[in-house]
C-alpha cells in the first residue's frame, strides 16, 4: 500500500503546522481569518477572561477522548458467571425483603475459584432480568458492608416497558474487594429511591428470581428461570505473571515519547505559536498551544515468521487491530479553548480534538 | 511519507487475515494453537453455552468503543456562562433552605440569548464551587419541574477534604428542555441523598454562593464569589443551518460503505471463517465472524489551495486531526466471545476490538 | 442566489437630502455587516460605512468624509440597506454601491449601483 | 489611513498573456488584501480575498500572492472577459481603504 521513505522531520511538522490552519478555521466554519479592524484597544474583558479560565478548568478537569486502555485490555478475558445464592437459603432470613428493598447474595468461593487474584479482575456486572414494569422506577444498588451496613452503589432510572429486559450494574470495584476480602457470601440490596421528603416510595419493579409461584410452575421456573448473577470478566490466572514482565506494552503518551529516543510510532512535540508559525494575530488567547503529532513506524508482523512467540508480544504494541497496514495515529485528544474576536464582539468557543496526548498503530 | 500504488485488495485481505491469526494467538497469549485431541465429543455443553450466550448478550447491548461522534462535534462551539440568578432574588422565598436542601435560580432568557435553538446545545454543565467537606457526603441533584415537583438527576459521592473544588453536573438535557419551553426561571436543587431507612440525612456540604456572610466581608465575597453557573457550548446560530447542507459528514460506518462505491476511506466488508480462512478447527464458537477492514486514501489538504472554502468543506472528512499524513483506521470496534478448549476444558473468552464497525481519517 | 439591488439615486442640488435603499435577497439578512461604497466619476473606489450585524448588536462605522453628514440604517424584517445622505455636496456625486461585508474585511457580493449627481 | 498604492494605473496586454497587477500598503496588513473586478459597465466582483484565496466562481487563471505591504494579483492565459479595472483593498484596519485601481486593455 505504500513504500516507506527517510522522514524529513521538518517536513512533517511544517504539513502539520498548514494542515493545523485549515483545521482551525475550518472548525470555526471560518473561509479566512477574521480582520482585527473592529477590535477595541486594550486587554480582554474581564467577563471574557473569566469564561475562557472557565472553559479551561473544565478542560483541565476532564479529557475529551477516554483513556488509552491498560494493556491488560488488549488480552482475551475468561468469562464466568455467578449464580445468585437461591433465595431458600438461611441468609436471606437476617434480611426480609421489604416493600422497598430485594436482597441477592453470591457466593464469594465460586468466584474466587475463578479469579484467583483481585487484581486479573477486568470487568464485573451484576445482571438482573426486570420483568415488565407498569410505571418509571427510580431504583438503586447497594453493597453489603460490614456489620449489616449498606453503602450505596449506584442508581437507574427504569422506564415502564412491556417485555422483561435485563438490566446490568458495573460492580467491578465491589467484585475486586470481595476476592481480596475473606468472606464467603456478600450481597446486594436493590431498593427504591426514596427522597428525604417522600417515604413512601415501593419498589415496583418485578426482578425474576424472586417471585412467588406455585406447584409445577415453580419447578419449571426454577429450571428455566434466569436468576441474578454476577457476570465476571478476568485475565486468566496463567497470564498474570505475564502482565508484569518486560515484556509490557508501554503507553505511547507525552510522558514516555517525550523523554525517550523511540523510533517506532510515538507522539511527538510541537509547540504551535500562533503569531509566529500561523502568522495570526486575531486568536487572542491563547497565544499558542501544544499540538503534538504522531510519527513512526507500525511495522507490519507477518504470523508466518518462524520466531513465533517473539512476535506474537510484538503485536499488541506494533498491530493490535490486526491491520493489514497498521498507522500511528492519534488515541488520546483533548480540547482547546481559543478567545477570538468576530466583529467588536469577543467570542470563547472551544475546539475539539486538537491537542495529541499519546498515539497508537491502528 | 508514503507513495501510494494502485491497491491489490486481495493482498490486502490476506495480510488482514494474516494479522488476525497474530492478533487471536496474541490475546490469547498462545505460542500456537491449542491441541484439539483431548476434547470431549458432541456438543458444548449447556452451561458453557449459557454463558457465551450471557457474553454475546452483553456486547449486544454495549459498544466497547465510543459512538464516532456526530459531525456537529467537530465544529467549534461558542462557550457562555450563566451565573445563578442572585439570593436575595423573591424566587428563593418559594422554597426555603431546609437543612437537607440548597435551592438554585437560572435566568433561562440569559440561556435563550446565547443559545437561540435547543438543537444547537452541545453540552451544559452546572458548575458549583463546593467549600472544605469534614465528612463523605451523598448528594443528589433534582431538576424544577412543571407544579414545583423536583426531578431526580444525578448524585454524587463527595469525598472529604481540606480545600474547596469545582463540582460539575451534566445537565445537557435539561437545559435542552429549558431552551425549548417558554419559562423565564428555571431551577436545580441539590439535596442530601435519604434511605428508605434513615430520615436524619443533613446536607453537610457548602456550596459557594449560599454563605451567611456579615459587613465588608458580605460585599467583597459577592464580588469575589463563585456563584453556582451553567457553563454551555453550542453551535454558534450562524453555522446552524449549514449543519442540515449536503456537506455534512458521512459516518464512514458498515451501513454506508457496504452499500456505496466509496474510493475513499471506507470500512470494507471481511468475513472470517475459522476453518476455511485460518485453516484452524479449535475454535468451537462462533464459526466465524464479521471481522471487517478499514481501507482508502484520505487526501492530505493543502490549506494554501486558492479554492479554499470548497477545501475547509472537507476537512471535517478527510483529515479532521489536521494530521501531516492523515491514514483510514478502525474508530468504532467491537468485541468477539469465543469458546474455545485447553485440553479437556471448555473456555468461554472475550477478545476487545476485533470487529471494525465504523472507519475515520485519522 | 445573492442578490444586491440599489435604488433612489437622482439629482440633488447642493445642501439637499435623498436616501438610498439597497433590497437584500439570497441569503440570511440579519446574519452580515452591510455596507455602502462609492466611486465618483473616473476615480477609485471608496468605503463610506457599514452597519453590523445581529450578533453585533446593529451598531454603526463611518468613514471620517462623511460622518455626521449620512447615516446607514435597515429595515431586517424586509431586508432592506438604507443610506439617508444629508447637506449633500457636489463631491458626493459618484455611484453609490451596496455591498456584503464579511468578517474577513472583504465584501463578497455587490449590487449593481445607483448614481447621484449633486448641482445646481 | 492605510493607504494603499497601484502604481500602474493602466496596463495593455494580448489574449492569452499572463500579466501581474501589484499594490502596496502603507504599511504592514497582515495578508488581509483583496482584489475586485470591474467591469466597463460599473459591475463590481469580489475575485481574491486574504492574499490568495479564490472567491467562488472565480476561474482559477486568476491567482493571488504577498505579505507584509507588497501583494500582486496574476492573471494567466488572458481572456476578453478580463478587460476591466482590478481594484485592491485592504480589509486590516478601519477605515477601509481602496488603491487607485489598474485598468487591463487589450493591444
Known amino acids: 500500500l505504500s513504500t516507506c521513505k527517510t522522514i524529513d522531520m521538518e517536513l512533517v511538522k511544517r504539513k502539520r503546522i498548514e494542515a493545523i490552519r485549515g483545521q482551525i478555521l475550518s472548525k470555526l466554519r471560518l473561509a479566512s481569518p477574521p480582520s482585527q479592524g473592529e477590535v477595541p484597544p486594550g486587554p480582554l474583558p474581564e467577563a471574557v477572561l473569566a469564561l475562557y479560565n472557565s472553559t479551561r478548568d473544565r478542560v483541565a478537569g476532564e479529557s475529551a477522548e477516554p483513556e488509552p486502555e491498560p494493556e491488560a485490555d488488549y488480552y482475551a478475558k475468561e468469562v464466568t458467571r455467578v449464580l445468585m445464592v437461591e433465595t431458600h437459603n438461611e441468609i436471606y432470613d437476617k434480611f426480609k425483603q421489604s416493600t422497598h428493598s430485594i436482597y441477592m447474595f453470591f457466593n464469594t468461593s465460586e468466584l474466587r475459584e475463578a479469579v484467583p487474584e483481585p487484581v486479573l479482575l477486568s470487568r464485573a456486572e451484576l445482571r438482573l432480568l426486570r420483568l415488565k414494569l407498569k410505571v418509571e422506577q427510580h431504583v438503586e444498588l447497594y453493597q453489603k458492608y460490614s456489620n449489616n451496613s449498606w453503602r450505596y452503589l449506584s442508581n437507574r432510572l427504569l422506564a415502564p416497558s412491556d417485555s422483561p429486559e435485563w438490566l446490568s450494574f458495573d460492580v467491578t470495584g465491589v467484585v475486586r474487594q470481595w476476592l481480596s476480602r475473606g468472606g464467603e457470601i456478600e450481597g446486594f440490596r436493590l431498593s427504591a429511591h426514596c427522597s428525604c421528603d417522600s417515604r413512601d416510595n415501593t419498589l415496583q419493579v418485578d426482578i425474576n428470581g424472586f417471585e412467588q409461584q406455585r406447584g409445577d410452575m415453580q419447578s419449571i421456573a426454577k429450571k428455566h428461570r434466569r436468576v441474578p448473577y454476577v457476570l465476571a470478566m478476568a485475565l486468566p490466572a496463567e497470564r498474570a505473571n505475564e502482565l508484569h514482565s518486560a515484556r509490557r506494552r508501554r503507553d505511547l503518551d507525552t510522558d514516555y515519547c517525550f523523554s525517550s529516543t523511540e523510533k517506532n510510532c510515538c507522539v511527538r512535540q510541537l509547540y504551535i505559536d500562533f503569531r509566529k508559525d500561523l502568522g495570526w494575530k486575531w486568536i487572542h488567547e491563547p497565544k499558542g498551544y501544544h499540538a503534538n503529532f504522531c510519527l513512526g513506524p507500525c511495522p507490519y508482523i507477518w504470523s508466518l515468521d518462524t520466531q513465533y512467540s517473539k512476535v506474537l508480544a510484538l503485536y499488541n504494541q506494533h498491530n493490535p487491530g490486526a491491520s493489514a497496514a497498521p498507522c500511528c495515529v492519534p488515541q488520546a485528544l483533548e480540547p482547546l479553548p481559543i478567545v477570538y474576536y468576530v466583529g467588536r464582539k469577543p467570542k470563547v468557543e472551544q475546539l475539539s480534538n486538537m491537542i495529541v496526548r499519546s498515539c497508537k498503530c491502528s | 511519507l508514503s507513495t501510494c500504488k494502485t491497491i491489490d485488495m486481495e493482498l490486502v485481505k490476506r495480510k488482514r487475515i494474516e494479522a488476525i491469526r497474530g492478533q487471536i494467538l496474541s490475546k490469547l497469549r498462545l505460542a500456537s494453537p491449542p491441541s484439539q485431541g483431548e476434547v470431549p465429543p458432541g456438543p458444548l455443553p449447556e452451561a458453557v453455552l449459557a454463558l457465551y450466550n450471557s457474553t454475546r448478550d452483553r456486547v449486544a447491548g454495549e459498544s466497547a468503543e465510543p459512538e464516532p461522534e456526530p459531525e456537529a462535534d467537530y465544529y467549534a462551539k461558542e462557550v457562555t456562562r450563566v451565573l445563578m440568578v442572585e439570593t436575595h432574588n423573591e424566587i428563593y422565598d418559594k422554597f426555603k433552605q431546609s437543612t437537607h436542601s440548597i435551592y438554585m435560580f437560572f435566568n433561562t432568557s440569559e440561556l435563550r440569548e446565547a443559545v437561540p435553538e435547543p438543537v444547537l446545545l452541545s453540552r451544559a454543565e452546572l458548575r458549583l464551587l463546593r467549600l472544605k467537606l469534614k465528612v463523605e457526603q451523598h448528594v443528589e441533584l433534582y431538576q424544577k419541574y412543571s407544579n414545583n415537583s423536583w426531578r431526580y438527576l444525578s448524585n454524587r459521592l463527595l469525598a472529604p477534604s481540606d480545600s474547596p473544588e469545582w463540582l460539575s453536573f451534566d445537565v445537557t438535557g435539561v437545559v435542552r428542555q429549558w431552551l425549548s419551553r417558554g419559562g423565564e426561571i428555571e431551577g436545580f436543587r441539590l439535596s442530601a441523598h435519604c434511605s428508605c431507612d434513615s430520615r436524619d440525612n443533613t446536607l453537610q456540604v457548602d456550596i459557594n454562593g449560599f454563605e451567611q456572610q456579615r459587613g465588608d466581608m458580605q460585599s467583597i465575597a459577592k464580588k469575589h464569589r463563585r456563584v453556582p453557573y451553567v457553563l454551555a457550548m453550542a453551535l454558534p446560530a450562524e453555522r446552524a443551518n449549514e449543519l442540515h447542507s449536503a456537506r455534512r459528514r458521512r459516518d464512514l460506518d458498515t451501513d454506508y460503505c457496504f452499500s456505496s462505491t466509496e474510493k475513499n476511506c471506507c470500512v470494507r466488508q471481511l468475513y472470517i471463517d475459522f476453518r476455511k480462512d485460518l485453516g484452524w478447527k479449535w475454535i468451537h464458537e462462533p464459526k466465524g465472524y464479521h471481522a471487517n477492514f478499514c481501507l482508502g486514501p484520505c487526501p492530505y489538504i493543502w490549506s494554501l489551495d486558492t479554492q479554499y472554502s470548497k477545501v475547509l468543506a472537507l476537512y471535517n472528512q478527510h483529515n479532521p486531526g489536521a494530521s501531516a499524513a492523515p491514514c483510514c483506521v478502525p474508530q468504532a470496534l467491537e468485541p468477539l466471545p469465543i469458546v474455545y478448549y485447553v485440553g479437556r476444558k471448555p473456555k468461554v473468552e472475550q477478545l476487545s476490538n476485533m470487529i471494525v464497525r465504523s472507519c475515520k481519517c485519522s | 442566489e445573492v442578490k444586491l439591488v440599489e435604488s433612489g439615486g437622482g439629482l440633488v442640488q447642493p445642501g439637499g437630502s435623498l436616501s438610498l435603499s439597497c433590497a437584500a435577497s439570497?441569503?440570511?439578512?440579519?446574519?452580515?455587516?452591510m455596507s455602502w461604497v462609492r466611486q465618483p466619476p473616473g476615480k477609485a473606489l471608496e468605503w463610506l460605512g457599514f452597519i453590523r450585524n445581529k450578533p453585533n448588536g446593529y451598531t454603526t462605522e463611518y468613514s471620517a468624509s462623511v460622518k455626521g453628514r449620512f447615516t446607514i440604517s435597515r429595515d431586517n424584517s424586509q431586508s432592506i440597506l438604507y443610506l439617508q445622505m444629508n447637506v449633500l455636496r457636489a463631491e458626493d456625486s459618484a455611484t453609490y454601491y451596496c455591498?456584503?461585508?464579511?468578517?474577513?474585511?472583504?465584501?463578497?457580493?455587490w449590487g449593481q449601483g445607483t448614481t447621484l449627481t449633486v448641482s445646481s | 489611513d492605510i493607504q494603499m498604492t497601484q502604481t500602474t494605473s493602466s496596463l495593455s496586454a494580448s489574449l492569452g498573456d499572463r500579466l501581474t497587477i501589484s499594490c502596496r500598503a502603507s504599511q504592514d496588513i497582515s495578508n488581509y488584501l483583496n482584489w475586485y473586478q470591474q467591469k466597463p459597465d460599473g459591475t463590481v466582483k469580489l475575485l481574491i480575498y486574504y492574499t490568495s484565496r479564490l472567491h467562488s466562481g472565480v476561474p482559477s487563471r486568476f491567482s493571488g500572492s504577498g505579505s507584509g505591504t507588497d501583494y500582486s494579483l496574476t492573471i494567466s492565459n488572458l481572456e476578453q472577459a478580463d478587460i476591466a479595472t482590478y481594484f485592491c483593498?485592504?480589509?486590516?484596519?478601519?477605515?477601509?481603504?481602496f488603491g487607485g485601481g489598474t485598468k487591463l486593455e487589450i493591444k
Open positions: 455591498a456584503r461585508y464579511t468578517g474577513g474585511g472583504y465584501f463578497d457580493y
Open positions: 483593498q485592504q480589509g486590516d484596519t478601519l477605515p477601509w481603504t
Open positions: 439570497g441569503f440570511t439578512f440579519t446574519d452580515y455587516y
